[in-house]
Interface confidence: low
């Protein structure tokens, strides 16, 4: 069937457009092209004599029309008046006629738009700014965009006139950015060149800076205002409601007790007329003398004794603060303040309450520190702790065990061997240890001022044959994307090798996989929920090779950003609200809801009969899992229209 | 300059049909939604609904469904109210009605208001 | 239907005064609109989605509330404010007006 293709179907004014025939048929004498849908003689464009090659103009020719062989008409130079429909109006050599009609769009090449503002100087939560994207060009589509981005949605935006108008009600500082519109046709797409908008605000209340309000005589004072405002503020300094200088800045140097009072910055804004003050009370104190700590106990016994440090010398009418390690005092139930803060009781003393410590004597708020004092807290010893950690030794090789404990004064120690006493050393050594090696290794750890006493066994099994390993975890049950999981394959052996599957494979070569300790330690960094596998050890010495039963590790994750299904935003009245949230968590998340921020039921199914438009608003899902500690949430729109609502009445008038 | 010119017979026998034009210029109906609203003497304002003249759409007070029709007339800019089988409970002032926004100015017009008589 | 009552329904102020008129609704509203008639006349919008003030509307009138319960205030009467008021809601269909307050000079 003979058609035409017009290409381009949208053309721009001054381009061109081929009007494209298919499926033209064979043994023609001739064909004609008219203006219009019909043939019609008036309207002829132009007729082509295929025998003679000979084009021939109609009344409708206006020099721009090219006709090819093929009967395809290339029209250039296009003007509005071009759009419509095209006729080819066909006679083959049997002179049967046919024709096809094809048709394009002329639209105007946009020009670069502009914005036309009706207040360049807004005063912040009390002008609205309009917007107009000039010139007004019909079948244009206007667009905005702000700072680059499409408007945000804002009940104080409003689109007008067509999109044509973007008004800011009530403008803040923060509407303070690069407006931009634009102009679209089939054709083309314009945009203006930016405009910034200058709001007027402030000024907010100043701040003085520095806070502090107390200082020492002869020190300087320096005190700053700010206060946010456009135009920049112009400051002002009272003292005790005199005026002293209009700078934003004022320095007073080798300050007096009679520098004493309310000093007051006034900040004002001269376009939008508005004052704002602050007022800070100055107080300039003497100097008291410097103070010393004195203490009951030089050598305190951990978890037996109490120190009380004391703070010199008393003075009446005086403030005492303390400090532990440069910090206030924490709140313990082990220390304890005199009535007059004078005395710091620690009560058990433990080896972290070594210090420093250091008082201060405040006359008012003006400070003097004493110099720090540390105590020599005793403890100890600590169960002492043998390495190496082999607990497997193969026959023939040297056994050397090293003891320690933590004690103040240092330890003693002693060895035992299957309760046999050995040796008053540190370290333990045994040559070319056999099976009748095998037993318990005792160290014992003694601290002569304390008097107490603290062991440690450990049992040696001398063999060649490793028993079947266990796995043993850092953590059972970690959290996605914040913790690792070091397994370590047990007992730990001389001369083993250690091997590692996962869910029957061997590792995968991934840079949150890390080998150690021999390989004996396997440990994922930064879990993921797909880490979720089996876990199997195996180790191999030269007489024996054996596999751990496998451990799954439990990895804690989500909850992840909810769905709402089912994904409708809009509803007719009358309808049942049936929301369903979902979000991937392990554990199972606890769900909750929010209706316009009022919270509703905990249920993971939300469900309103036979809504209005009343149930309107943010249908908020939240999701919290109470073993990650985790939460989200995902918020959505629900409209609920009246039949034929009125999209006009929604806001306004 | 925006106004809203009502048209329509002022009596109306009982039984019989209120017909009443109002005719917009200075605006496009089609880019807005047209109300008719009406006061009987003395009394307070009765919405009686709209219409969306670019396709017809209306929205009528329950009230009055079954016995009115709002239509428009594009091309004359123009919309009209027809409220059947009147009586003398629908003696009133019937006034046309259109909300405007212009940039932030929500803008308000009403037709002069028509007062129609319902009596034999 | 939502029900609006309007209170009071009618009074009588000197110029200068400051009226309040309240509004109603039997059922929570998102805004309310208020409207001034004077005889005669058609109404004429003063206060748009409860505080705003329509085009060429004097500052002295203001709007608040929330919910069911609505403001409307003239801070200080002037003659020509002789008229009566009326509150609209527009959240539900059909819309509804209050019965109206008018307002007098002592």
């Known amino acids: 069937k003979l058609t035409i293709e017009s290409t381009p179907f949208n053309v721009a004014e001054g381009k061109e457009v081929l009007l494209l025939v298919h499926n033209l048929p064979q043994h023609l004498f001739g064909y004609s092209w008219y203006k219009g849908e019909r043939v019609d003689g008036n309207r002829q464009i132009i007729g082509y004599v295929i025998g003679t090659q000979q084009a021939t103009p109609g009344p409708a020719y206006s020099g721009r029309e090219i006709i090819y062989p093929n009967a395809s008409l290339l029209i250039q130079n296009i003007i509005q008046n071009d759009t419509g429909f095209y006729t080819l109006h066909v006679i083959k050599s049997d002179l049967v006629n046919e024709e096809a009609t094809g048709q394009f769009r002329v639209y105007p090449e946009l020009p670069k738009p502009s914005i036309s503002s009706n207040n360049s100087k807004p005063v912040e939560d009390k002008d609205a700014v309009a917007f107009t994207c000039e010139p007004e060009t019909q079948d244009a589509t206007y667009l905005w965009w702000v700072n680059n981005q499409s408007l945000p949605v804002s009940p104080r935006l409003q689109l007008s006139n067509g999109n044509r108008t973007l008004t800011l009600f009530n403008v803040t500082r923060n509407d303070t950015a690069s407006y931009k519109c634009e102009t679209q046709n089939p054709v083309s797409a314009r945009r203006s060149d930016s405009v910034i908008l200058n709001v007027l605000y402030g000024p907010d209340a100043p701040t003085i800076s520095p806070l502090n309000t107390s200082y020492r005589s002869g020190e300087n004072l320096n005190l700053s205002c700010h206060a946010a405002s456009n135009p920049p503020a112009q400051y002002s300094w009272f003292v005790n409601g005199t005026f002293q200088q209009s700078t934003q800045e004022l320095f007073i140097p080798n300050i007096t007790v009679n520098n004493s009072g309310s000093y007051t910055c006034q900040a004002h804004n001269s376009d939008t007329g508005l004052n704002r003050t602050t007022v800070t009370t100055i107080t300039v104190y003497a100097e008291p003398p410097k103070p010393f700590i004195t203490s009951n106990n030089s050598n305190p016994v951990e978890d037996e004794d109490a120190v009380a440090l004391t703070c010199e010398p008393e003075i009446q009418n005086t403030t005492y603060l303390w400090w532990v390690n440069n910090q206030s005092l924490p709140v313990s139930p082990r220390l304890q303040l005199s009535n007059d803060n004078r005395t710091l009781t620690l009560l058990s003393v433990t080896r972290n309450d070594v210090g420093p410590y250091e008082c201060g004597i405040q006359n008012e708020l003006s400070v003097d520190h004493s110099d720090p004092v540390i105590l020599n807290v005793l403890y100890g010893p600590d169960d002492p702790t043998i390495s190496p950690s082999y607990t497997y030794y193969r026959p023939g090789v040297n056994l050397s065990l090293s003891c320690h404990a933590a004690s103040n004064p240092p330890a003693q120690y002693s060895w035992l061997i299957d309760g046999n006493i050995q040796q008053h050393t540190q370290e333990l050594f045994i040559s070319n240890i056999t099976e009748k090696n095998s037993g318990l290794y005792t160290c014992q750890a003694n601290n002569s001022a304390s008097g107490h006493s603290r062991t440690t066994v450990k049992t040696i099994t001398v063999s060649a044959e490793l028993p079947k390993p266990s796995i043993s975890s850092n953590n059972s049950k970690p959290v996605e994307d914040k913790d690792a999981v070091a397994f370590t394959c047990e007992p730990e052996a001389q001369n083993t090798t250690y091997l590692w599957w996962v869910n029957g494979q061997s590792l995968p070569v991934s840079p949150r996989l890390q080998l150690s300790n021999g390989n004996r330690t396997l440990t994922l960094f930064n879990v993921t929920r797909n880490d979720a596998r089996a876990y199997v050890c195996g180790i191999q010495n030269s007489v024996s090779a054996n596999r751990s039963d496998p451990v799954t590790l439990d990895v804690l994750y989500g909850p992840d950003t909810p769905i709402i299904s089912p994904p409708d935003s809009s509803y007719l009245s009358g309808a049942n609200l049936n929301l369903s949230c979902h979000s991937a968590s392990n554990p199972s998340p606890q769900y909750s809801w929010r209706i316009n921020g009022i919270p509703q039921q905990h249920t993971q199914v939300l469900f309103i009969a036979k809504i209005t438009p009343n149930n309107n608003g943010t249908y908020a899902c939240f999701v919290s899992n109470l073993a990650t500690g985790r939460n989200n949430s995902i918020v959505k729109s629900i409209t609920v229209s009246a039949s034929g609502t009125s999209p006009g009445l929604s806001a306004g008038a | 300059e925006v106004q809203l010119q009502q048209s329509g017979p002022g009596l109306v026998r009982p039984s019989q049909t209120l017909s009443l034009t109002c005719t917009a210029s200075g605006f496009n109906i089609k880019d807005n939604y047209m109300h008719w609203v009406r006061q009987p003497p003395g009394r307070g304002l009765e919405w009686i609904g709209w219409?969306?003249?670019?396709?017809?759409?209306?929205e009528y007070a329950p009230k009055f469904r079954g016995r009115v029709t709002m239509l428009a007339d594009t091309s004359k800019n123009q919309f009209s109210l027809r409220l059947s089988s009147v009586t003398a409970a629908d003696t009133a002032v019937y006034y046309c009605h259109v909300l405007i926004y212009a940039g932030y100015l929500a803008m308000d017009y009403w037709g002069q208001g028509t007062l129609v008589t319902v009596s034999s | 239907d939502i029900q609006m009552t309007q209170s009071p329904s009618s009074l009588s102020a000197s110029v200068g005064d400051r009226v309040t008129i309240t509004c109603s609704a039997s059922s929570s509203v998102t805004y309310m609109h208020w409207y001034q008639q004077k005889p005669g006349k058609a109404p004429k919008l003063l206060i748009y989605s409860t505080s705003n003030l329509a085009s060429g509307v004097p500052s002295r009138f203001s709007g608040s509330g929330s919910g069911t319960d609505y403001t409307f205030t003239i801070s200080s009467l002037q003659p020509e404010d002789i008229a009566t008021y009326y509150c609209q809601q527009r959240s539900t269909y059909p819309l509804t007006f209050g019965q109206g307050t008018k307002l007098e000079i002592k």
């Open positions: 219409i969306d003249p670019e396709n017809g759409d209306t």
